[in-house]
C-alpha cells in the first residue's frame, strides 16, 4: 500500500480552521490479521529523509493523535486532550484520514507528516508516511480563506466551503 497526500501545500490566514488530509492507496488487506495504526506529527525536511523526526503538534505527540483500526474502517480521536488543543484526527471508510486544526496561529506553520503502520501478525511492520506544508499568514498578503496546492500540479484550489473561520 501507499500513502498519498492530495495537497502538498496549505496556505491559510490566522484564525482559520484547516483539515490536512492523507489517503491510503493500493491493495488494503481487510483480513483479521491486519490492522493499521495511523497518526500525525510535525517534522522537518531532513537531509536524508523527510518526516524521520517526530515533533509534537501543539504539544501533542504522535502517541496522543493516533488512530487504530483494521483496513478502511472509520475512526476518530475522541480524546478530550486533543480537542482541548483544537485538534482532531479522523479516518473514513475510503482510506482517507485527516487532522483538523482549529484557530490557526503563525506558530502552526511548518511541515506535517501522516504516518501509517501496517501491523500484520508475525510479520515485520510496514511504515509509510506523507508530508505536507502548512503556511499560516497574517496581514494584507494573507488569503481570506485557506488555499491548497495539489501535490501533482501547482494549480491552487480555494477550500473556503470546507473550512470555516473560527468563531469564539
Amino acid at each position: 500500500f501507499k500513502v498519498a497526500t492530495p495537497y502538498s501545500l496549505y496556505v491559510c490566514p490566522e484564525g482559520q480552521n484547516v483539515t490536512l488530509t492523507c489517503r491510503l492507496l493500493g491493495p488494503v488487506d481487510k483480513g483479521h490479521d491486519v490492522t493499521f495504526y495511523k497518526t500525525w506529527y510535525r517534522s522537518s525536511r531532513g537531509e536524508v529523509q523527510t518526516c524521520s523526526e517526530r515533533r509534537p503538534i501543539r504539544n501533542l505527540t504522535f502517541q496522543d493523535l493516533h488512530l487504530h483500526h483494521g483496513g478502511h474502517q472509520a475512526a476518530n480521536t475522541s480524546h478530550d486532550l486533543a480537542q482541548r488543543h483544537g485538534l482532531e484526527s479522523a479516518s473514513d471508510h475510503h482510506g482517507n484520514f485527516s487532522i483538523t486544526m482549529r484557530n490557526l496561529t503563525l506558530l502552526d506553520s511548518g511541515l506535517y507528516c501522516c504516518l501509517v503502520v501496517e501491523i500484520r501478525h508475525h510479520h515485520s511492520e510496514h511504515r509509510v508516511h506523507g508530508a505536507m506544508e502548512l503556511q499560516v499568514q497574517t496581514g494584507k498578503d494573507a488569503p481570506s480563506n485557506c488555499v491548497v496546492y495539489p501535490s501533482s500540479s501547482q494549480e491552487s484550489e480555494n477550500i473556503t466551503a470546507h473550512h470555516h473561520h473560527h468563531h469564539h
Epitope: 502517541q63 480524546h79 511492520e125
Partner: antibody
Framework: QVQLVESGGGLVKPGGSLRLSCAAS????????MSWIRQAPGKGLEWVSY????????YYADSVKGRFTISRDNAKNSLYLQMNSLRAEDTAVYYC???????????WGRGTLVTVSS | EIVLTQSPATLSLSPGERATLSCRAS??????LAWYQQKPGQAPRLLIY???NRATGIPARFSGSGSGTDFTLTISSLEPEDFAVYYC?????????FGQGTKVEIK
Amino acid sequence: QVQLVESGGGLVKPGGSLRLSCAASGETFSDYYMSWIRQAPGKGLEWVSYISNSGSPIYYADSVKGRFTISRDNAKNSLYLQMNSLRAEDTAVYYCARDLPGWYFDLWGRGTLVTVSS
Amino acid sequence: EIVLTQSPATLSLSPGERATLSCRASQSVSSYLAWYQQKPGQAPRLLIYDASNRATGIPARFSGSGSGTDFTLTISSLEPEDFAVYYCQQRNNWPRTFGQGTKVEIK
C-alpha cells in the same frame, strides 16, 4: 505524565509460578501496545512478550513460549505476565514498557525482581 | 532472529572526551534501530530512534547514524552523567532484539 509500576516479583522455587502486574496511571492505557522486557542480574536486556492494545496479536520470545502468558485488562489499566514452570534462568528484573507500532520502548516501569532458586 | 553485536564491550574515557559506540546487525534492519541509556538501578531510557533522531529531551551531544547493518552512537563530549550502559535495539523484525550493551566508564 503516565507512569508504569510493576509488582508481583519475589522468590520462587524452580517449577513454580508467579504473576506479575503492571499498573498504568492515566486514561489512555487502552491505546497502549505493551511489552515485557527482562534483565538478568549484571546482564543485558531481553524482550519477553508483546500484546497489542486490543489484546491480539500476542507474541513471545522462544525462551518463554509455552510457559508464560501475557494478558491485559484495559478497564483496570493493567498488564499481566503469568509465569509458569519457572527456571533459574528466568531470574531477572522484569520491566513493562510501552511498545507502540512503528516506535520503540519509550515508557518503562521501574521493574520488579523475580528470583528463581531452591 | 536478528543478532545485534555491540562494540566495544567497555569504553574507558574521561569527561569531555568523545565516545563512539558501534552496533552491527546480522541482517539489515533498515533504519529501525534505537539506542537506550541505562544507569545502575534504573530502567533504560530511549535516546535515539530510527537510527539518527534524538528522543524528546535528549541533549544535542548525543547523535546517531547508520542504516542497514552498521550503526553508531556518538557522544560528542562526555558529561559526568553520561557514564552508563548503552544498548541498541531493532524493531524491523520479530522478535525484538537488543545488543549486549556497551559500558562507558570513567577512565
